[in-house]
Each structure stands twice: as structure tokens, then as C-alpha cells.
Interface confidence: low
């Protein structure tokens, strides 16, 4: 399918590449003192960015530092010091900066006050950082400032004092609109959800919080639950862990209208040392992890329905150490339907696992072509890739980035890994797919730093060293062919490679500093290589691609939820720019239902290697622990229910007896009285 | 070379200010922090407190706040250390040194020490009456 | 503030021979700690930096160990020119604080 990577040999050497980049490589020296060094982008496609470097000595008594505040407008190439835009004060690190929503232009920086002061101080920016207003809040806050996704002027944040402070105008003007709260999130439409406790505090009434809602910005409440333990936001859907009423043990309760009615999610319940996690969600389902009882470091992945009710059993042995903790579980943005993670075997292994029908079924990770078993392998010819996630960056492996696909980079996903039975606790390489994890290839020997750039018309490396660096590896054919550029005489101890979010840009930039002797100074190198990719992308310059293929001669070949996408595609030999305003071309197409396309309803389950679903034989002719929108009513079920977000029309209709489902509503979540009712059977 | 050289010892009556003086070469003044540390006779090594060249701002320690102030001349690339309120125990040599003071290795994340790297030669203060 | 001890106070060595100095914290310092050197009538001496590396111009013998609380210098053999007294000096919270020392003399 494709031949081992290269780099500069056996591969085509793109004509003056040295003289195109020298050209275009923008060096910035940042004269300052600073210890670390935060980056944001400010809007998309402005080019602007806004680094903060800080200085802090943590001393007990007085904690004294200072902030530099530089502005580029030119994707990095050349930086402004505009720290005199915030009085010269020292901001607030914990805080970092609070980017608006969207292209607003909105900044906020929190910046350091002195312990005395009747609350904060910020710095506003709705121009994209050209001008700040500083102004002095009325609070301390806790968190950083939180916009509203539909409207940048709203803002929430929470104080010291645990105060739910809302701004209607970005910032200006702040108005406490509740007292005692614990979490609070913006939802849809300007509503504001939030917890607050009613006795001693947020840590000694988990379990006995409430859960609030308002949706006109503080002015009325609706309480919308008791006895929280916690709640999220995932997608369209609500969710609230609720404690039960016998024991210590709590259950996810599930709303798709704000909180107005609930169900309980037909979930595991967990107990105090267990934790629920939405791994994933989107308008259709969510993933959601449930904690194995102990202190297993796993769990399981259950996928929802499109009510988020009814939960089908998708993997054992998750990976997921704690709460809070690592798991590896990725989205895998480039290919729909696709997602990697990591199981715990018995043998306390870690291997890695893919889905490519939205958890469906998990299989591993087939084996890169040309690449051999490694140590953890019984059989030296059969084995597979396994990938390197946040749990081995949490271990310490050499492994210095996570995944990596993007949306506009179609079936292209990057990550460090090894061959074998599990994965390895070796140096890992790099391998990449270009079908969206269907099959793999070695892309760099060893661990190294990537970005995709211009849609993955360009891939860029960095090895990972402990020594100062001075060269970046680039790639125009998806990581076949590799050139290697010096762009820097100096090398430096790099921290980072920097590009505005989307890889739709052309420009990297490398960041890093020199020592002399023991004095740092921070640096980055800007290349452009829009010179190397001179010329726009043609029509000729793209093939179509069918996604999910892995058998051209069935019917249903690239079927994945009912549909088939065919995308076009850059071919590899092509240098040419996709450009800032390239949009992934893709034409999808209906496929027939079948059995595949339905997961089991309420009271249903598959058994192993059977594609008919049947009923749960503990429970016929038993009351049923379940609760609809919280109130009791006939549930009625053929037994199918159609995966959320599938699309296939005709073909197999599973038809059988729609069965009455009585069952009692054990959930006294809203309304004590009326979810208590029962109803005998 | 980089050094740091103090001025030269000093006598003071209880209650009197002594000013000690710290001039760097060798390098860029402002790329470091200076810590001032002192040593009484026969005894070990105290940290007094620690001034940002670029900004002039400052951080003692607990024991000497109120009484030491740090200043710096960026033009002659000197820092001063002044201690008000003398009294017989502040008996002393008292160091200069040039500090990174935590300065952050790869990254936000991870906090590296570099130590004190230069120090100036001392310079001894006597209190006595 | 973060307390530093070090032992032994004295230490008697002869030399060629091996010398272990310890220092402990009252409290985690991660790496952020350095020793230094300290001869009669002179200026304190950077040795050891970030808790294991050795500053420039300082000899393979002067080695630096541990993180957290409990902190090692050794010395692997012994030159005339290394009795002195040695302090270590955390930089993990302020104020920085230096242990009380070890005096290194010949035995």
C-alpha cells in the first residue's frame, strides 16, 4: 500500500526548499525573565496571537511576579510587547486567558491583586487584544470567566466566597445573582445551570446539593433537582448523578429539556468511591464510562440510545484510573464513527482498541505492514499496533504528544505506539494512518512533537530530545517522504510547537529557549511554507476516496451508521496548497437497514455473536427499576431501537410484537410524591 | 567575567542603617533576580530576600520585613540592600548573589533550581556601641 | 517556612575516602535544591544545582541525589582542597532556606 517512510533518501527532494524556507522562517526574541510561557489565539484566520510570559517566586509572605504581554498579528512571525495595554500588572497564570467565543475579539485576563482588595481586577478586550480596559470586580473570582457559547457579553463566574457573580455586559458591570453555589455551566440558550448546598458547603452536602436553573440571567429560578451529586453537560443531553434514597449509591438521571423532566439512565449504579464519566457526546448519544467497583483502574463503556436513556454494554475493561484520572479514550475527528482507547487485562497489560461504528464493536489495531512483534509479542508474527495516549504521558513514557487527527485532514491520524501484544514500555515511534485507523505505517523513528498543517497537505515534526534542537522535519505526501530543514544555527531547548487551531494554516512556529551559561531567553521560529505549496490546489489535484472501505465488492461496503461517505481527497503526489478556505468535499450516500443498524431497547440485550435482540430473561414478569421523564406511563418496545445518528432507510425492518413494559418509578428525584407512584403488575 | 562586587565593610551604632552596595558585570543586569543572604560569626547561611531588576520589585523574608529594603540602579547596574534598626545580632557578612529563583524548565509545568550561581565577595557589617 | 537539616553536623574523613552528606526537608521541595561550598574567610560555592546536576567547572567526584524530602551529596574521594563546610539550600517556597551545614575536616 505504501513503502516505509523515508527522509531525504528515496524520496523526491523538493526543488530549493532550503532557500523557500530560510526565506520564510521569522525568528522572535523575548527579552524577559519569564518561567513559563502561555500562548492563545485570539479569533480564526486573524493571525493574532497573545503570549503571556510569567515570573513568579513563590514565596510564602509575598508572592511577587511579574507578566509580559506580547501581540502578533501575523500568525507569530513578529511579536509586539504590549504589556504596558495592562498597567504593566501581573496576571494571574491559574486563570490563563479567557478567549470569547467564535471570532467576538474577546479577551479577559485575570490579573493579581493584593490581599487586602475588596475583589479582582481584570483586563478586557473586545478588538482582539489591540486595547484593555481594566476593570475592578466586586469579588474575587475563583474561576476564570466563563462566556456564554451564544452571546460573548454574557459572562459567569464564581467567587472565593462561592458567590455566582453574571455580567450581561462583557465584564462592565457584575451582579451576584446566588449565594452558596458549587458548579455552575452555561447550557443552551443563555440558560445557566448550577449546584448549590444548603447546609455546611460544597464538599460536606455532595450528595445533598441542588441542582438549579435559571434562563433569564438570575432574575427567576427554577430548582430542577435534589440530592446532586454531581452533574455535566453532554451534547443535547442533562445528566446529574443522583444519591439514592437506601444507601450511599447514586444513578444517572438523564434530561433533554433542561432539567424540566427527567429519566433514569437504565445504568449501573455507582457507591462512594466509583465515578460516572461522559467520555463523549454529541447531538445523537454519549459515551459514558461506569467505575468498576475497587480500585481496578477500569470500568466499563456503555453507548446510549438517542433519548440517552437506555444504554447498550460497548466495552469491558476500560482503562480509567480515578477520578479526574487519565483514560485514553479519542475521538478520532478525522474519520466519523471512529474512536481508540485502552483496556486492562488481566494480566494488567494495556492494549489499545478501535471502534469504527461509534462503539459498536471494539477490535485492535491491525498490525503496521513491514513492522515487526516487539518483546511484549507471544507470536512474533501476529500482533498490533498499540498507541500511546494520556496514560502513558501520565506514566512518564517517552511519548511526548497525544493523538492527533483533525476534522479537515480526512482518514489522516498521527500517534506514537508500538507492535506487539500490549503496549511497550520502550522508546515508542510514530505511525500514521490515512484511512482513519483501518491499517497503519511507521511515520518516524523514536518519539517526536507533530502538527498537521493546510488540511494535511503538510505534516511537521520535531524529535523529542533532551538536547538543544535546530532541525523540523516536513511532509507533503502524509508522512511518507520526509525533508529536513535547519532553522535555527542556535539550537535550542524547544518547549512546544505552536499553529492555529484547525490546521488550516501554513505557518508553525517553534518555540523554545537558549542558555548561555545560565541566563534562559525565549525564543520562536515563525516558517511559512506556503513557498514550498506554491501553487493552489486543482481539481486534478484531488481523487475520491471511499471512507470505511474494507471489501469494494459488497454492497454495503463503507456502510457505517447507515451511510456511506465518499470524499475527495488530496493526492499524495501533490504539492499544492489546499488553502485557508478548503472544505472537506464528501458525498454521502443511503444504505439499507439492517440488524446492525438497531440496538437493543429496554429490556433487550444481544447475546455474544448474535445479531437478534431477545428479551432479559431476569426480568420477565418483574417490575422494572426503570424511570421515563419521571412519572409513570406504559412503555411500550418491539424490542429494537434504531442507533442514534444512523441514517439507513429500507431494507430490514425488525417487526415483532410491540410488548407492554409496566414497571414501577423508583426515582424520587424532582418531585418526592408524584415519583414515588408505582404501579402494581 | 561575571561578577558581583560589594562595597566595603562598615561599622554602625544600634539603631543606625547600614547601605550595602552590589554592582554586576559580566552579564545582562536585568536577565536576573539578586538574593541577599547573610552569615553571622561562626554561623550558617540566612536568606534575606530577593529584588527583580526589571521591575524593582521585591520579596523578604519574614524576619527582616520592615526593616531591609531593596532597591537597584539599573543605569549603573548595582543593587543595594538596606537594613534600618541595627542591632547587635544583625553582626554579619552579608552576601550578594545572582538567583534564578525557580525559573521554569521545559514548560509551564515543571519548576527547576538553578542555584545561586555568582556571589559577590561579602561584606562585613559590625554593630557594636 | 520549609525547615532544612543537615547531617551530620561533623563529619571527620580521610582523604581519598568516600564522604555522604545528607539534608532533609520538613516538607517536599521536588528538585529545587542546591549545595554549595564554603571555605574559611571566602564567598559560599555553587556545586550542585536542581538537586543532581553539577554546576560548571565543578569535579565528577561532587555528586547530588534525591527528590521530595531527602537529599544526598557525595564526594567520592576525598581531595585536600574539599574540607569546607557544605550547606544545602531549598527553592521550592519562599523563603529560601539553607540547612545549618556540614563541616567536612580531615580526620
Known amino acids: 500500500r505504501r513503502g516505509a517512510p523515508a527522509e531525504d533518501q528515496d524520496c523526491g527532494r523538493l526543488p530549493d526548499f532550503i532557500a523557500k524556507l530560510t526565506n520564510n522562517t521569522h525568528q522572535h526574541v523575548f527579552d524577559d525573565l519569564s518561567g513559563s510561557v502561555s500562548l492563545s489565539w485570539v479569533g480564526d484566520s486573524t493571525g493574532v496571537i497573545l503570549v503571556l510570559t510569567t515570573f513568579q517566586v513563590p514565596l510564602v509572605i509575598v508572592s511577587f511576579g511579574q507578566s509580559k504581554l506580547y501581540r502578533s498579528e501575523d500568525y507569530g512571525k513578529n511579536f509586539k510587547d504590549i504589556t504596558n495595554l495592562i498597567n504593566n500588572t501581573f496576571i494571574r497564570t491559574e486563570f490563563g486567558m479567557a478567549i470569547g467565543p467564535e471570532n467576538s475579539g474577546k479577551v479577559i485576563l485575570t490579573a493579581e491583586v493584593s490581599g487586602g482588595s475588596r475583589g479582582g481586577r481584570v483586563f478586557r478586550s473586545s478588538d482582539f487584544a489591540k486595547n484593555f480596559v481594566q476593570t475592578d470586580l466586586p469579588f474575587h473570582p475563583l474561576t476564570q470567566m466563563m462566556y456564554s457559547p451564544q452571546n460573548s457579553d454574557y459572562l459567569l463566574a464564581l467567587s472565593t466566597e462561592n458567590g455566582l457573580w453574571v455580567s450581561k455586559n462583557f465584564g462592565e458591570k457584575w451582579e451576584e445573582i446566588h449565594k452558596a453555589v458549587c458548579l455552575a455551566k452555561w447550557g443552551p440558550n443563555n440558560i445557566i445551570f448550577f449546584t448549590t448546598h444548603v447546609n455546611g458547603s460544597c464538599k460536606a452536602d455532595l450528595g445533598a446539593l441542588e441542582l438549579w436553573r435559571t434562563s433569564d440571567l438570575g432574575k427567576t429560578f427554577k430548582t430542577i433537582g435534589v440530592k446532586i451529586y454531581s452533574f455535566g453537560l453532554g451534547g443535547r443531553f442533562l445528566f446529574a448523578s443522583v444519591m439514592a434514597d437506601k444507601d450511599t449509591t447514586r444513578r444517572i438521571h438523564v434530561s433533554t429539556d433542561q432539567g424540566d423532566t427527567w429519566s433514569m439512565a437504565q445504568l449501573p449504579s455507582v457507591g462512594q468511591e466509583q465515578f460516572y464519566s461522559i467520555l463523549a457526546a454529541n447531538e445523537d448519544m454519549v459515551f459514558m464510562h461506569v467505575d468498576e467497583p475497587g480500585d481496578t483502574g477500569f470500568g466499563t463503556i456503555f453507548t446510549s440510545d438517542d433519548r440517552g436513556i437506555v444504554y447498550s454494554k460497548s466495552l469491558d475493561r476500560h482503562l480509567y484510573t480515578t477520578t479526574g484520572g487519565e483514560t485514553d479514550f479519542t475521538n478520532v475527528t478525522s474519520l466519523r464513527g471512529v474512536y481508540i482507547t485502552s483496556t486492562l487485562s488481566e494480566d494488567n497489560s494495556i492494549q489499545s482498541m478501535i471502534t469504527f461504528d461509534q462503539g459498536g464493536r471494539w477490535e485492535h489495531l491491525r498490525k503496521p505492514e513491514n513492522s515487526k512483534c516487539d518483546a511484549t509479542a507471544k507470536n512474533k508474527n501476529e500482533c498490533s499496533l498499540h498507541i500511546h495516549a494520556s496514560y502513558s504521558i501520565s506514566q512518564k513514557l517517552n511519548v511526548p504528544m497525544a493523538p492527533l487527527s483533525e476534522p479537515n485532514a480526512v482518514g489522516i491520524v498521527i500517534a506514537h505506539g508500538s507492535v506487539g501484544d500490549a503496549i511497550s514500555v520502550m522508546v515508542p515511534d510514530v505511525y500514521i494512518s490515512d484511512d482513519g485507523g483501518y491499517s497503519w505505517a511507521k511515520m518516524l523513528e523514536g518519539p517526536h512533537y507533530y502538527t498537521i498543517l493546510d488540511s494535511g497537505g503538510i505534516i511537521v515534526a520535531i524529535e523529542h530530545s533532551n538536547r538543544p534542537i535546530n532541525v523540523i522535519k516536513f511532509s507533503t505526501d502524509e508522512g511518507q517522504c520526509w525533508q529536513s530543514y535547519v532553522f535555527t544555527q542556535e539550537p535550542i531547548y524547544f518547549t512546544g510547537l505552536a499553529s492555529e487551531p484547525g490546521a488550516r494554516s501554513m505557518n508553525i512556529s517553534i518555540w523554545g529557549f537558549t542558555e548561555s551559561f545560565i541566563t534562559r531567553q525565549w525564543v520562536s521560529y515563525t516558517v511559512d511554507f506556503k513557498d514550498i505549496l506554491e501553487r493552489n490546489c486543482e481539481e486534478d489535484d484531488y481523487t475520491t476516496w471511499l471512507a470505511h472501505s474494507t471489501d469494494p465488492g459488497d454492497y454495503k461496503d463503507g456502510c457505517i451508521l447507515g451511510y456511506k461517505e465518499q470524499f475527495l481527497r488530496l493526492r499524495k503526489s501533490s504539492v499544492c496548497q489546499n488553502g485557508r478556505d478548503y472544505v472537506v468535499a464528501k458525498q454521502p450516500s443511503v444504505c439499507p437497514c439492517s440488524l446492525e443498524d438497531f440496538l437493543c431497547d429496554f429490556g433487550y440485550f444481544r447475546p455474544e455473536n448474535a445479531s437478534e435482540c431477545v428479551e432479559q430473561p431476569e426480568l420477565k414478569g418483574h417490575e422494572l427499576e426503570f424511570c421515563l421523564y419521571g412519572k409513570e406511563e406504559h412503555l411500550t418496545t418491539n424490542g429494537y431501537r434504531k442507533i442514534p445518528g444512523d441514517k439507513c432507510q429500507g431494507g430490514m425492518n425488525p417487526a415483532r410484537e410491540v410488548k407492554d413494559l409496566k414497571k414501577k418509578c423508583t426515582s424520587n428525584f424532582l418531585n418526592p410524591t408524584k415519583q414515588n407512584s408505582k404501579s402494581n403488575s | 567575567q561575571v561578577q558581583l562586587v560589594q562595597s566595603g565593610a562598615e561599622v554602625k551604632k544600634p539603631g543606625a542603617s547600614v547601605k550595602v552596595s552590589c554592582k554586576a558585570s559580566g552579564y545582562t543586569f536585568t536577565s536576573r533576580y539578586m538574593s541577599w543572604v547573610r552569615q553571622a560569626p561562626g554561623q550558617g547561611l540566612e536568606w534575606m530576600g530577593i529584588i527583580n531588576p526589571v521591575g524593582g520589585s521585591t520579596s523578604y523574608a519574614q524576619k527582616f520585613q520592615g526593616r531591609v529594603t531593596m532597591t537597584r540602579d539599573t543605569s549603573t547596574s548595582t543593587v543595594y540592600m538596606e537594613l534600618s534598626s541595627l542591632r547587635s545580632e544583625d553582626t554579619a557578612v552579608y552576601y550578594c548573589?545572582?538567583?534564578?529563583?525557580?525559573?521554569?524548565?521545559?514548560?509551564?509545568?515543571?519548576?527547576?533550581?538553578?542555584?545561586?550561581?555568582?556571589w559577590g565577595q561579602g561584606t562585613t557589617v559590625t554593630v557594636s556601641s | 517556612e520549609i525547615v532544612m537539616t543537615q547531617s551530620p553536623a561533623t563529619l571527620s574523613v580521610s582523604p581519598g575516602e568516600r564522604a555522604t552528606l545528607s539534608c532533609r526537608a520538613s516538607?517536599?521541595?521536588?528538585?529545587?535544591l542546591a549545595w554549595y561550598q564554603q571555605k574559611p574567610g571566602q564567598a559560599p560555592r555553587l556545586l550542585i544545582y536542581?538537586?543532581?546536576t553539577r554546576a560548571t567547572g565543578i569535579p565528577a567526584r561532587f555528586s547530588g541525589s534525591g527528590s521530595g524530602t531527602e537529599f544526598t551529596l557525595t564526594i567520592s574521594s576525598l581531595q585536600s582542597e574539599d574540607f569546607a563546610v557544605y550547606y544545602c539550600?531549598?527553592?521550592?517556597?519562599?523563603?529560601?532556606?539553607f540547612g545549618g551545614g556540614t563541616k567536612v575536616e580531615i580526620k
Open positions: 548573589a545572582r538567583d534564578p529563583s525557580g525559573i521554569a524548565a521545559a514548560g509551564p509545568a515543571s519548576r527547576y533550581y538553578y542555584g545561586m550561581d555568582v
Open positions: 516538607q517536599s521541595v521536588s528538585s529545587n
Open positions: 536542581g538537586a543532581s
Open positions: 539550600q531549598q527553592a521550592r517556597l519562599g523563603p529560601w532556606t
